[in-house]
């Protein structure tokens, strides 16, 4: 009978024993202790740092390769052994029981081959598992490395942010403390100022009371003085009459009074009043008065302002009469009045300066070295000579001068009524390159306007200016 047994020897090596009648064959296989069985494999059981696991896997792979190599060598040896050493027995067996022995040997060979194939397959499986595990571990390692980097970066960023915030906080705390200190100081000084002001107010109140008393006294004194002056004048008058009946005393006193009458701002300036502001001027050869704004700063001062545009607060679409006598507020938008300008510019040669402002912060001027107006019978026709300045080389007031036109007095050279078309009173041509009395348009609405505040040779046809000032001064100032 045949008996086929597989067992382990005392030191754990696998052995295959074949019993055939009185013959016993024992095969010792190479050691495979380093190969773990698939059941002992625990996936993802990472117990320590990945790099050590990885080295371990490499080592195990090397051992497995060695085992495979050993198995292969052993199989070759087995084949050789069977071929060489079994020849004798084969002969004997052939003699005794050829068929039976052959069957046994075939069975043994088959079993051995099966066993080897099984072992090889298992080894291949283990190798594949090890490779898979290695790959998986490598990926995990890479992921861990990336996430560690990411976390480290986040921690660094947060740390930096925290530091920044701490710095900022410290700075703000310091600032708040500083401000508190400042506020305390300021409050103290304000309180002191308030106390001082209260003292000052009470002082001023008493001064005012004193002045009021003095004023009452002065008024009384003034009345007395006026009466005395009147009496004296009468006495002088009678004395003069007695001495020289042919000479009128009135002339002497009128001449004295004329010294405090100002025909224009140049006279105001020359009298020592050199502050910008509104002054009362008197028409030449008349007692009629007019309030005018005097510019005492521009180009040496002494300028009588005859027109100003600055904010659109005054309507310039006015009648002939209104342009004749003037309108508006001398310290703001206004037209001084054609009649006064006609009269004053016919006394002596005057210069005209026109100052312009656009909406982009630019300023320019036109200066006419000789300027005067004709009288009302000639429609206050404008006369200009000698243009200089930065608001255009060509005059934006048409030359020769045109008559003045208003909505109710059409004296222009257009088939239309320019004053009606373009609004405002002006020395229109047909209708011409300027109109400083046009509609006032605010910023961003000041372009593409037919009827705005126009000075063609500075800003072109459709541009409406931000501000204008027309002022006059004697040429010999």
């Amino acid at each position: 009978y045949n008996n086929f047994r597989r067992s382990m020897d005392s030191i754990g090596r696998r052995q295959y024993q074949v019993q055939h009648g009185s013959c016993s064959y024992t095969f010792l296989l190479p050691e495979t202790d380093n190969c773990r069985s698939p059941g002992s494999y625990v996936p993802n059981a990472v117990q320590r740092d990945a790099p050590l696991d990885y080295d371990d896997s490499v080592q195990r792979l090397q051992v497995l390769e060695n085992i495979m190599e050993n198995n292969t060598q052993w199989l070759i040896k087995l084949e050789n052994y069977i071929q060489d050493n079994m020849k004798k027995e084969m002969v004997e067996m052939q003699q005794n029981a050829v068929q039976n022995q052959t069957a046994v040997m075939i069975e043994i060979g088959t079993n051995l081959l099966n066993q080897t194939a099984e072992q090889t397959r298992k080894l291949t499986d283990v190798e594949a598992q090890v490779l898979n595990q290695t790959t998986r571990l490598e990926l995990q390692l890479l992921e861990h490395s990336l996430s560690t980097n990411k976390l480290e970066k986040q921690i660094l960023d947060q740390t930096s942010e925290i530091n920044k915030l701490q710095d900022k906080n410290s700075f703000l705390e310091k600032k708040v403390l500083d401000m508190e200190d400042k506020h305390i100081v300021q409050l103290r000084s304000i309180k002191e100022e308030k106390d001082q002001l209260q003292v000052l107010v009470s002082k001023q109140n008493s001064i005012i009371e004193e002045l009021e008393k003095q004023l009452v006294t002065a008024t009384v004194n003034n009345s007395v003085l006026q009466k005395q002056q009147h009496d004296l004048m009468e006495t002088v008058h009678s004395l003069l009459t007695m001495i020289s009946p042919s000479k009128s005393p009135k002339d002497t006193f009128v001449a004295k009074e004329e010294q405090i009458i100002y025909r224009d701002c140049a006279e105001v300036f020359k009298s020592g009043l050199t502050t910008n502001g509104i002054y009362t001027l008197t028409f030449p050869n008349s007692t009629e008065e007019i309030k005018a704004y005097c510019d005492m700063e521009t180009s040496g001062g002494g300028w009588t302002v005859i027109q100003r545009r600055e904010d659109g607060s005054v309507d310039f679409q006015r009648t002939w009469k209104e342009y004749k006598v003037g309108f508006g507020n001398p310290s703001g938008e206004h037209w001084l009045g054609n009649e006064f300008v006609f009269q004053v510019t016919n006394q002596q040669p005057y210069v005209l300066k026109i100052h312009l402002k656009d909406w982009e912060g630019n300023e320019a001027y036109s200066l006419y070295e000789h300027f005067y107006l004709s009288g009302e019978e000639l429609n206050y026709r404008i006369h200009l000579k000698g243009l200089t300045g930065t608001a255009g080389k060509i005059s934006s007031i048409s030359q020769p001068g045109n008559d003045f036109s208003t909505k109710d007095a059409d004296n222009d050279k257009c088939i239309c009524k320019c004053s009606q078309m373009l609004t405002g009173g002006w020395w229109f041509d047909a209708c011409g390159p300027s109109n400083l009395n046009g509609m006032y348009y605010p910023q961003r609405q000041n372009t593409n306007k037919f009827n705005g505040i126009k000075w063609y040779y500075w800003k072109g046809s459709g541009y409406s200016l931000k501000g204008t000032t027309m002022m006059i001064r004697p040429a010999d100032f």
């Epitope: 390159p433 063609y456 072109g460 541009y463």
Partner: antibody, heavy 121, light 107 residues
Framework: QVQLVQSGAEVKKPGSSVKVSCKAS????????MVWVRQAPGQCLEWMGY????????GYNQKFEGRVTITADESTSTAYMELSSLRSEDTAVYYC??????????????WGQGTLVTVSS | DIVMTQSPDSLAVSLGERATINCKAS??????VAWYQQKPGQPPKLLIY???TRDTGVPDRFSGSGSGTDFTLTISSLQAEDVAVYYC?????????FGCGTKVEIK
């Protein structure tokens, strides 16, 4: 005699630009404003803008603001109108015309022969 | 923008008869109105400005009138060469605007 001669017809793709020229002769180019007016098929006349060749000042119809640019070359007495971001609705005859007055954009006394601009993909 | 509304859209008149075209402005334009004549394939031609002034070389059969918001162009005795489209135009304020035209034909 006073004459305005415009450039020839143009066919343009949507989104592109067109530049039409207008050469003036028979008068002093800088003495009058030049306007551009267009006439789409079956539509009203439409004022696009003007240029004052004396100082280069321009004014545009808000409808075309940002798309139209009017320029002038004094040396050649030529005005130009460029319209960008063309669309099919811009298909029209474009005219240049002279204003009667330098200082104001009044009425238009001399016209160019017109330039047909077709916008088609 | 000021809207200029022309009426009628078209007009058929016998030769030698009067043709009247109206134009209404959406707001007061004073007398800042011009009239143009446009024949097929030609640019517009100025006829009237400042509502009633004929341009140089324009026959006296053409006349304009009106102020404020209502304006009229009259052809006193229609001639064959007057067949055209007529446009009114306001230049009182920016942007200048045009009517959409009145086509005049011979009946």
């Amino acid at each position: 005699q006073v004459q305005l001669v415009q450039s020839g017809a143009e066919v343009k793709k949507p989104g592109s630009s067109v530049k039409v020229s207008c050469k003036a002769s028979g008068y002093s180019f800088t003495d009058y404003n030049m306007v551009w007016v267009r006439q789409a098929p079956g539509q009203c006349l439409e004022w696009m803008g003007y240029i004052d060749p004396y100082n280069g000042g321009t004014g545009y119809n808000q409808k075309f603001e940002g798309r139209v640019t009017i320029t002038a070359d004094e040396s050649t007495s030529t005005a130009y109108m460029e319209l960008s971001s063309l669309r099919s609705e811009d298909t029209a005859v474009y005219y240049c015309a002279r204003t009667r007055d330098r200082y104001d954009v009044w009425y238009f006394d001399v016209w160019g022969q017109g330039t047909l601009v077709t916008v088609s993909s | 923008d000021i809207v200029m509304t022309q009426s009628p859209d078209s007009l058929a008149v016998s030769l030698g008869e009067r043709a009247t075209i109206n134009c209404k402005a959406s707001q007061d334009v004073y007398i800042a109105v011009a009239w143009y004549q446009q024949k097929p394939g030609q640019p517009p031609k100025l006829l009237i400005y400042w509502a009633s002034t004929r341009d140089t070389g324009v026959p006296d059969r053409f006349s304009g009138s009106g102020s404020g918001t209502d304006f009229t162009l009259t052809i006193s005795s229609l001639q064959a060469e007057d067949v055209a489209v007529y446009y009114c135009h306001q230049y009182s304020s920016y942007p200048p605007t045009f009517g959409c035209g009145t086509k005049v034909e011979i009946k």
